[in-house]
Amino acid sequence: VSPTFQVVNSIAPVQECSTQLDIVIVLDGSNSIYPWDSVTAFLNDLLERMDIGPKQTQVGIVQYGENVTHEFNLNKYSSTEEVLVAAKKIVQRGGRQTMTALGIDTARKEAFTEARGARRGVKKVMVIVTDGESHDNHRLKKVIQDCEDENIQRFSIAILGSYNRGNLSTEKFVEEIKSIASEPTEKHFFNVSDELALVTIVKTLGERIFALEAT
């Protein structure tokens, strides 16, 4: 798990600077993610404390496996409540492959376009949640560089559940997902033992995303 997240008293005034963020969550919905309820619980806990609205934070969700689906665009919902209802309804689309590079690239090229609600001059944040090595990892380096060129801040989350269930080494997988995260990696990369443990990173992830508003 990521190293210590330091919270000091001086962080409080960050909350007085409520600027805007465009956040796209890129969810691995391939067959190996189980139980899906843990993913929707994670989304609920993360999103319920966000200030979602057309002049505040906007959230879009992209799901990928073999293919990519835009679950909803950044400008689809104009309140936290609406987003929470929509996020609860997201179903696992499945797929035998984990096309992480495709998912990230689609989010960059499509989800972060003005046509889908992205706002000019607003900080872009991508949260990538996946449970396995990508089948298109040869494309990852280029895709991540493209995100970097467009100033997209990336938080990546590695779910180790399928590896732990199969008693497999996680080393290569963790390295891949670390490579997706923005620098400094220790502030942008998370790993959890299984899907159920996703909720145990929500608070730290939320604070880190929220801190971006002030930078």
Partner: antibody, heavy 120, light 113 residues
Framework: QVQLVQSGAEVKKPGASVRVSCKAS????????MHWVRQAPGQGLEWMGW????????NYAQKFQGRVTMTRDTSISTASMELSRLRSDDTAVYYC?????????????WGQGTLVTVSS | DIVMTQSPDSLAVSLGERATINCKSS????????????LAWYQLKPGQPPKLLIY???TRESGVPDRFSGSGSGTDFTLTISSLQAEDVAVYYC?????????FGGGTKVEIK
């Protein structure tokens, strides 16, 4: 300096509703979640829920679901808590309290408390 | 819900002596992603609102005297008043913020012997 000033004591009959307000000053009201906590006579502290003053989003403790409504008026930096269908065991001191971080809910500033007495 | 259990219910300590209050949670409140314990301590005096003393289990709130200290990890926590003063007579509560609903211990009343 940060201050949370609550409305005055209330006496209500069972079945009625009560509304307690909490006026914030000395900080940016919309930047910090406001929580409500109560303490019944001779009892401990009990969390009721929070409101995000910026978005109006709420999270209520299961025990109070359907009976509590938390609202805010950003123009006057005031959060309010309404509890309906009052019972005698709702007699308590009700506090508003501010959380300094968004996702980690310790409570750094508290209102002075509002005594609500429910009696027939 | 996480249940917080405090002990003892009350405590009588001589002025200048050490007072120790225990708090136990029904599950770990150690937040693994930041390696911090989501536990706070409050002081409650009659007719006054609660006052925050400690958060992250051991971080003293600004302005709180250094005779107050917090320790512990996981499920077992302690608030220590190293040298009890007359103004420390109060009821002390622990609170977890690992998950909602936020829950408090039952309180420990500290008196002077």
């Amino acid at each position: 300096q940060v201050q949370l000033v609550q409305s005055g004591a209330e006496v209500k009959k069972p079945g009625a509703s009560v509304r307690v307000s909490c006026k914030a000053s000395g900080y940016t009201f919309t930047g910090y979640f406001m929580h409500w906590v109560r303490q019944a006579p001779g009892q401990g502290l009990e969390w009721m829920g929070w409101i995000n003053p910026n978005s109006g989003g709420t999270n209520y403790a299961q025990k109070f679901q359907g009976r509590v409504t938390m609202t805010r008026d950003t123009s006057i930096s005031t959060a309010s808590m309404e509890l309906s269908r009052l019972r005698s065991d709702d007699t308590a001191v009700y506090y508003c309290a501010r959380a300094p971080l968004r996702y980690f809910d310790w409570l750094d500033y508290w209102g002075q408390g509002t005594l609500v007495t429910v009696s027939s | 819900d996480i249940v917080m259990t405090q002990s003892p219910d009350s405590l009588a300590v001589s002025l200048g002596e050490r007072a120790t209050i225990n708090c136990k949670s029904s599950q770990s409140v150690l937040y693994s992603s930041n390696n911090k314990n989501c536990l706070a301590w409050y002081q409650l005096k009659p007719g006054q609102p609660p006052k925050l003393l400690i958060y992250w289990a051991s971080t003293r709130e600004s302005g709180v005297p250094d005779r107050f200290s917090g320790s512990g990890s996981g499920t077992d926590f302690t608030l220590t008043i190293s040298s009890l003063q007359a103004e420390d007579v109060a009821v002390y509560y622990c609170q977890q913020y690992y998950s909602t609903p936020l829950t408090f211990g039952g309180g420990t009343k500290v008196e002077i012997k």
